[in-house]
Every structure is written in C-alpha cells, then in structure tokens.
C-alpha cells in the first residue's frame, strides 16, 4: 500500500470509558495533528476509515458497523459506542485518505469496570475548590454531544456511594453541584450519573471527579521564611560540620510556582568551589499550602566559610523573601589554668 | 425505628379521586426519594411513582402518568398519592417505600400497605 | 420502559434444596438491580442490591449475582421460611420496573 503519514500511537490521549455506557470519541487527527477539520476534508473529497487492535493482539482489523442496536457507529469524526463492552479495549486508529493523501493516528481505548458505588482503576479529574470562598460549582464533565438539546435527561450527584440530598452545604442543581462554603469535610470523590432516553433505551453517564479543598487566595500571603531568624546563631569552630536548615512557609496558590534557593556570598552553591550540599524536603497541610526545607551542609567548615554570607532566599507568585543565616565563628574557651592564674594575679 | 404508615384507602367508584397518604418516622424524611407501589389481588409489583427527597423530580408509570399526582411535605413527614379519574384497573394495595441514597436505589423500607378498591 | 422477565414463575423445592431463580432484561442495567421477598399479606421485603450486595439482616444463605442482562437470585439451602414470592426490580432507569414475580411453594 502506498505511504501513509503515521503519526504512531498517540498514548498521550490514554482514553478511558466505563463499561455499559455511551462513549463518543473524537478523531484525535483533527483535533491535534492536522490543521484543517473533518468539513474540510470531507469537502476535499478525503475518506475517513476507522479500524482498530484488540487487546493482546497485533492484528489491525476493521471496526464492525454492523452489530445489532448499530452497538458501534461512525458520525462525522467520531466513533460511537451505545454502550461500551470490556472487551472493546485496544487500539483505535483513524486514517484520513484519497488517491493521493493519507494520515493516520493510533490511540488506546481502555474500557473499565465501575462497582456500585462508582470504583474503579479510572485516572479521576482533580477539581480544587477555595476553603470558606463563598459559593463554588463543579460541573458534571464531558457530557456534551451525547443527546440533543430536546432530551431532557435526569442527573444525580453522588458524594461516595451517597446520594446528595439535603447535605449542609452542597447542593444540586442539575449539571451543577453548587459548595456554598467549602470546607476541608468537602474533599472526596463527587459522581454524576447522567441518565438520557434513545431509541427506547435508557443510557447513563457517569463521571466521577475528585474535590480537593485548598488555602483560599484571600488568605495568600507571601513566603514565608520561618529559618534562618534572627534567634538563632550558628557558632562553629573550623572542622565542625555546619547545617544550616531554609525553611519556607507558602500559601496555596493556583499555579504558583514555589522555589528556595541559597546564595553564599551572593552566588549560587553551583557557582562556588566550597563542598556544599544541599538537601531538600516538602510538607503539605490540608489546604495543600506547602513547606519547604532546604538543609545546606558543610561537612568540614573553615574559618573561611564561617566569614561567608548565607543567605536563604524565597519566591512564589506572591512575592519574594531573603533571610541571612547568623554564622559566626566559635571563639575558643580560655584555658582554665591560665584564667585562674591571671585572675589572682600569678606570676 | 423507621416507620411508614399508609392511610387514605376504600372504595371509590371509576372516575373519582381518591388521596393516600403516608406518614414517616424514624428517621430524616427529607433526605430520602420516596416511592409508591402497587399489588393488585393476586399479581405481581407495580411500581407507580417516585418523588426526590426534595419534590424537584417526579417520574410515573405510564399507567398512571396524568392521572396519579407524588407530592411530600417536608415539615410533616408525609408522603402524598393524589389519585384522580380512577379506573377498575387501579383496585390494588398501595405501598410507600424509602428509597435508601445509593446508586442502586433499593427500597429498604415499606409500610403495610393500604387497599384501594375501585367498583361501581 | 425496561422490561424484567423472571424465571420461573412458580418452583416448587423441598427444604434443603439449593435453588435459582433468574431476571433477564431486555437491555443492559449494569448492576442496578434488587431482589425482594413478599409473604402473603405482608410488605415486600428488600433481600439483595445491586446484583450482589447482601441487605443487613438477611441469611447468607441467600446470593446474587449477575450484570447486564442477566441475574440470578440464589438460595444455598432452603428453610422453611423461604417459602414466598420473590421479584426483581431494576433502578437503571427513572422508571422502575419490577420482574412478574417467582412463587416458591414446598413440594
């Protein structure tokens, strides 16, 4: 057969459906490897021709259209399952083609089993809601395309294997779920079933994301530098060790980058020929604002070292704060012997 | 212990209305979809309608759609079946059932059922 | 609407027996079907959900299990008490549909 423009498998796009419920899948050729839409090549007079492997196999077969109920159909750009079998999992590839153009791209379908209470092996979506913000939603995903704007379908939102009714502060309000006040009881793992007639079936929908409660932005401060301060005193003699701990409090933000760094003498540890190491560790509490501790170690400190400036800075989309470690070097004790001799006057 | 008590039943001619009630306790009503089902002498379950635990949706049987009205109210713990333009068809026992909150949505509860006999 | 087809209809057994009693759908309701027990002149009572799930209180004797289409209400040793009426019920849909019903009556 003649050359065909392979865009191989495309596992960034590692689709996941439930069993027993409706799947639309886009042909991803469109959507992110091609620079024109499905109209345009369809008006081009281009073919496209769906066929896929199954699991555990490498035989590349054609798709069968032809099961009872049209189980699995072609629309435009898009494969249709009504509904979704286990067995369904594998490979998918669509291709693009005429006489004289053809692309093509592979992508894994993998189709999962749901207990009753909405379990499963899933990669779940993380919805962050802002603690004590006034009201928040999340909407039921994914959904559109599915039934026409007539169908009016039923939805219920779970929280767990619950049904939300009447709970404190979160309400449904069809394909929105609605936090008046999220609080950190809020986190888990919120499910709507969407159920929709077709053809005189009934089908669900069911997507299920996981709530994560964070430090709200009306509360973000800058970081926070709680070591090295000013109470604290590193006194060494040379050939000690010297640990120096950075510890850095930052508040959740949104897609904020957090870093800690130390500077000796105004440059990076990287940049200077001292034995330097530096050890890093990150907490989190339960709004996910963070804490970082980055221990800088002289295993053997010289008296050179102790005149040096360590300085501990800190960044994050709220600002930046430095703080200067207090190094100083021991001075040694006098020796006992001579201090009582000169305290009494010896000679 | 949860409690459903049906009450409302008797004899009514075709074409007339009739209204059931069931009243609840033992526990929080307003958190629970409530059903009604039916039993003609001698047959099987039917099921008749249900009302979320807050009356925003309402489904029926279309044997009833149009006819039978679920309504709740909250503040009484009672649970509605408004019957209207009843047929000969309709003489069964009427039970309420809770629906326990899960996916699955089982009837966990039933009250005894009270008799609605539709003759002229 | 979902059509739920039991059978049998009617099964006479003896005590001690292990009996099955099936539902089939006329289409796929995954999980999202209960079995009850009804004893003349009395409310049905709920025995199992979801397929398989056993409700508080009930023997083990009693099981579930199939999805899709196809259920299966089992008793591993039948008592005395177990004689009644047995239906499916299916959830999947706004509108619930019960099974006809299956009569276990002593041989």
């Known amino acids: 057969s003649e050359r065909c423009d392979d865009w191989g498998l495309d596992t960034m796009r590692q689709i996941q459906v439930f069993e027993d419920e409706p799947a639309r899948i886009k042909c991803p050729l469109f959507e992110h490897f091609l620079k024109f839409n499905y109209s345009t090549a369809h008006s081009a007079g281009l073919t496209l021709i769906w066929y896929w492997t199954r699991q555990d196999r490498d035989l590349e077969e054609p798709i069968n259209f032809r099961l009872p109920e049209n189980r699995i159909s072609k629309e435009k750009d898009v494969l249709w399952f009504r509904p979704t079998l286990l067995n369904d999992t594998g490979n998918y590839t669509c291709m693009l083609r005429n006489t004289t153009y053809c692309s093509k791209v592979a992508f894994p379908l993998e189709v999962v089993q749901k207990d009753s209470c909405f379990n499963s092996p899933m990669k779940l979506p993380v919805h962050k809601l802002y603690i004590e913000y006034g009201i928040q939603r999340i909407t039921c995903p994914n959904v559109d395309g599915y039934f026409p704007s007539s169908v009016k379908p039923t939805i219920t939102w779970y929280m767990g294997c619950y049904k939300i009714q009447n709970f404190n502060n979160v309400i449904p309000e069809g394909m929105n779920l609605s936090f008046l006040i999220a609080l950190i009881s809020n986190n888990g793992n919120y499910t709507c079933v969407v159920t929709y007639p077709e053809n005189g079936r009934t089908f669900h929908l069911t997507r299920t994301l996981t709530v994560k409660v964070v430090g709200s932005p009306k509360n973000a401060v800058p970081p926070v530098i709680h070591s090295p301060n000013d109470h604290v005193v590193y006194e060494k003699e040379p050939g000690e060790e010297l640990l120096i701990p950075c510890t850095v409090y930052f508040s959740f933000l949104m897609d904020s980058r957090n870093e800690v760094w130390w500077t000796i003498d105004g440059k990076k540890p990287d940049d200077i020929t001292i034995d330097v190491t530096i050890n890093e560790s990150i907490s989190h509490s339960r709004t996910e604002d963070e804490t970082r501790t980055q221990i800088l170690s002289i295993k053997k400190v010289t008296s050179e070292d102790l005149k040096r400036s360590y300085v501990c800075h800190a960044r994050s989309a709220k600002g930046e704060v430095a703080k200067a470690a207090k190094v100083k070097q021991k001075v040694p004790a006098p020796r006992y012997t001579v201090e009582l001799a000169c305290g009494f006057g010896a000679t | 212990q949860v409690q459903l008590v049906e009450s409302g039943g008797g004899v009514v001619q075709p074409g007339r209305s009739l209204r059931l009630s069931c009243a609840a306790s033992g526990f929080t009503f307003r958190n629970y979809g409530m059903h009604w089902v039916r039993q003609a002498p001698g047959k099987g379950l039917e099921w008749v309608a249900v009302?979320?635990?807050?009356?925003?949706?309402?489904f029926y049987a279309d044997s009833v759609k149009g006819r039978f009205t679920i309504s709740r109210d909250n503040s009484k713990n009672t649970l509605y079946l408004q019957m209207n333009s009843l047929r000969v068809e309709d003489t069964a026992v009427y039970y309420c059932?809770?629906?326990?909150?899960?996916?699955?949505?089982?009837?966990?509860?039933w009250g005894q059922g009270t008799l609605v006999t539709v003759s002229s | 609407d979902i059509q739920m087809t039991q059978s049998p209809s009617s099964l006479s057994a003896s005590v001690g027996d292990r009996v099955a009693i099936t539902c089939r759908a006329n289409?796929?309701?995954?999980?999202?079907l209960n079995w009850y027990q009804q004893k003349p002149g009395k409310a049905p009572k709920l025995l199992i959900y979801?397929?398989?799930s056993l409700q508080n209180g009930v023997p083990s004797r009693f099981s579930g299990s199939g999805s899709r289409t196809d259920f299966t209400l089992t008793i591993s040793s039948l008592q005395p008490e177990d004689f009644a009426t047995y239906y499916c019920q299916q959830s999947y849909s706004t509108e619930i549909t019960f099974g006809q019903g299956t009569r276990l009556e002593i041989k």
């Open positions: 009302i979320w635990y807050d009356g925003s949706n309402k």
């Open positions: 289409q796929s309701i995954a999980s999202y």
């Open positions: 059932a809770r629906e326990e909150g899960i996916a699955v949505a089982p009837f966990d509860y």
């Open positions: 979801g397929a398989s």
